[in-house]
Interface confidence: low
Amino acid sequence: GVTSAPDTRPAPGSTAPPAHGVTSAPDTRPAPGSTAPPAHGVTSAPDTRPAPGSTAPPAHGVTSAPDTRPAPGSTAPPAHGVTSAPDTRPAPGSTAPPAH
């Protein structure tokens, strides 16, 4: 479905899993959850983009929510695709390490 969240991309959740492809819904991009498993494709809901989770196991597809774009999790496993939802792009978790 199409989500009409913020016009930014979500940042990674503290439990979201890492992903190579991040999927997002709203106008932002979601970030990974801290406990989510790593994924190649991360899925999220809002208009943001998801980021990998710090403790989640590695996965190929991660799901997230907002309209933002996800940011990397500090301990999340590697992933190729991250999925998020809102129209924004996710940002990293509060404890996530700096992104390169």
Partner: antibody, heavy 128, light 112 residues
């Protein structure tokens, strides 16, 4: 070889419909977010629509909202753009584009958010 | 929406000489994750666009080192240290920090 091949373009009258297709090969299509980006004759680039790797999340430019629908079939490695109520201003070359969000390794994730693979485009002409 | 403004519109350059293209965004492109998702694309005549630079200054695979990107916040620059004949085309900046994704109007690089 990583490749995106668009098809389905053509000449259509205002108010008409077209369905564009994009065949992906050389990479794991279901891992990537995809977008449609268009370029009117002699003009710049305009992002049209975006779809998450699973197909659950979709975004549209205001200029096409309510008229265009993006979808994908990961089993067929294909991306689609259903275009209805076409207008003269929709005339453009439509590109199928792969977006790389980044990768994670060793507990660290690195985000890119870049458009790294572009098809050659398919031309849509809306004219009476 | 974030508006991307490029200057100049056209840049006639002598072969072997440097070229510089500016891109300014209507608001900061720094994402909440600390990254700045600003890319540069090259479109040669009759071809689709091609990624050159991502996240301000990172050269994409296969891109010659004569291309470099710099900037921060709202002001960004693409530089070609020594223009070659194959560099002729239109260059676009693009932001991927926020939806809708938006592009600059393009700068045409041509040989004098």
């Amino acid at each position: 070889q990583v490749q995106l091949v668009e098809s389905g373009g053509g000449l259509v009258k205002p108010g008409g419909s077209l369905r564009l297709s994009c065949a992906a090969s050389g990479f794991t299509f279901s891992d990537y977010y995809m977008s449609w980006i268009r370029q009117a004759p002699g003009k710049g680039l305009e992002w049209v629509s975006y779809i998450s790797s699973s197909g659950t999340t979709k975004y549209y430019a205001d200029s096409v909202k309510g008229r265009f629908t993006i979808s994908r079939d990961n089993a067929k490695n294909s991306l689609y753009l259903q275009m209805n109520s076409l207008r003269a201003e929709d005339t453009a070359v439509y590109y199928c584009v792969r977006e790389n969000l980044g990768y994670c390794t060793g507990g660290n994730c690195f985000y890119y958010y870049y458009m790294d693979v572009w098809g050659k485009g398919t031309t849509v002409t809306v004219s009476s | 929406d974030i508006v991307m403004t490029q200057t100049p519109l056209s840049s006639p350059v002598t072969l072997g000489q440097p070229a510089s293209i500016s891109c300014r965004s209507s608001q900061s492109l720094v994402h909440s994750d600390g990254n700045t998702y600003l890319s540069w694309l090259q479109q040669r005549p009759g071809q689709p666009p091609r990624l050159l630079i991502y996240k301000i200054s990172n050269r994409f695979s296969g891109v010659p080192d004569r291309f470099s990107g710099s900037g921060a916040g709202t002001d960004f620059t693409l530089k070609i240290s020594r223009v070659e004949a194959e560099d002729v085309g239109v260059y676009y900046c693009m932001q991927a920090t926020q939806f809708p994704l938006t592009f600059g109007g393009g700068t045409k690089v041509e040989i004098k």
